[in-house]
């Protein structure tokens, strides 16, 4: 059947240096798996920015921090039967 | 392939300015980054710059004195050093970032290296 | 800053044996770790990505585990050729270190 998601590690406030590289964790559990999903201030976090990669574990990397990556980031973990949110603030300075 | 050159001995404070020439890749669609090996064998992480050199990255340890550049029409990558300090010395290679899936940051060509020693 | 730590420094063993390097982390990496070989004299090649990925022109007797802060190289049925320097790196957020490096050697 399926269970809604629970997100068991979210992403964690922090500073980043520009131009480095961060990371924010989402781990979730749930049934069917969670599909996972991230927003910056609301908006659609785009993959097609070749600075910015899924990789595994619910982890998104940004390459490359800019000034303009600053802003309040949130995990969306789906299933079928709900969703969970989860945010943190970046501050790329 | 890829061929460093421009290395030496340099005095402290001095600059140097390091070559990267590629070839056999469609090099203006891979990011590049500079590695060096210390003396005690140990590696180091120096610059990486993207695919169009529009963003670079640098560690505090070379921040402010090192800049690494490309030139995409002419297949080459630099690294200008300056103030240049004893524990810069070091072997430098140039290498090219894999393209993976997933897209974990490997570096999947490297060059010869060229020697940088800072003496006086 | 992630630090990495590996060991052994050093290793000697004999033709045909397996051997395991490990690499820890002073922070949780979620896989985000790559292994590289340094033959004497010559530059560093790619072994390993993501952990467990293996490059694509490596030999199967290599192999990566691990997750979270612990991580591991396999080297099964140990040849001459595998002499070397490996290194980890962690490739999670910058800085991206790298450990220290352990030497293989042949009995």
């Known amino acids: 059947g399926s269970m809604g998601p629970v997100i068991r590690q979210g992403p964690v406030n922090q500073t980043v240096a520009v131009d480095g590289t961060f990371v924010l964790s989402c781990v979730a559990t749930g049934s069917p798996v969670p599909t996972i999903l991230w927003r910056k201030d609301g908006v659609l976090v785009s993959t097609q920015d070749s600075r910015i990669k899924q990789l595994e574990n619910g982890v998104l990397q940004i390459r490359y921090a800019k000034l303009g990556d600053t802003g309040r980031y949130t995990c969306i973990a789906s299933t079928p039967s709900g969703e969970a949110t989860w945010s943190a603030y970046i501050e790329v300075q | 392939q890829l061929v460093e050159s421009g290395g030496g001995v340099v005095q402290p404070g001095g600059s140097l300015k390091l070559s990267c020439a590629a070839s056999?890749?469609?090099?203006?669609?891979?990011?590049m980054s500079w590695v060096r090996q210390t003396p005690d064998k140990r590696l180091e992480l120096v610059a990486t710059?993207?695919?169009?050199?529009?963003?670079?990255y640098y560690p505090d340890s070379v921040k402010g004195r090192f800049t690494s550049s490309r030139d995409n029409a002419k297949n080459i990558l630099y690294l200008q050093m300056s103030s240049l300090k004893s524990e810069d010395t070091a072997m430098y290679y140039c290498?090219?970032?894999?393209?993976?899936?997933?897209?974990?940051?490997?570096?999947?060509?490297w060059g010869q290296g060229t020697s940088v020693t800072v003496s006086s | 800053d992630i630090q990495m730590t590996q060991s052994p420094a050093s290793l000697s063993a004999s033709v045909g044996e397996t051997v395991t390097i490990t690499c820890g982390a002073s922070?949780?990496?979620?896989?985000?770790l790559t292994w590289y070989q340094r033959k004497q004299g010559k530059s560093p090649q790619l072994l390993i990505y993501?952990?467990?990925n293996l490059a694509d022109d490596k030999s199967s007797r290599f192999s990566g585990s691990g997750s979270g802060r612990q991580y591991s190289l396999k080297i099964s049925s140990l040849h001459p050729d595998d002499v070397a320097t490996y290194y980890c790196?962690?490739?999670?957020?910058?800085?991206?270190?790298f450990g220290s490096g352990t030497k293989l050697e042949i009995k």
């Open positions: 290498a090219r970032e894999a393209l993976l899936r997933p897209p974990y940051y490997a570096l999947d060509y």
């Open positions: 790196q962690n490739v999670l957020s910058t800085p991206f270190t």
């Open positions: 993501g952990a467990i």
């Open positions: 056999g890749f469609t090099f203006s669609t891979y990011d």
């Open positions: 922070e949780n990496i979620a896989g985000a």
């Open positions: 710059i993207n695919s169009n050199g529009g963003s670079t």
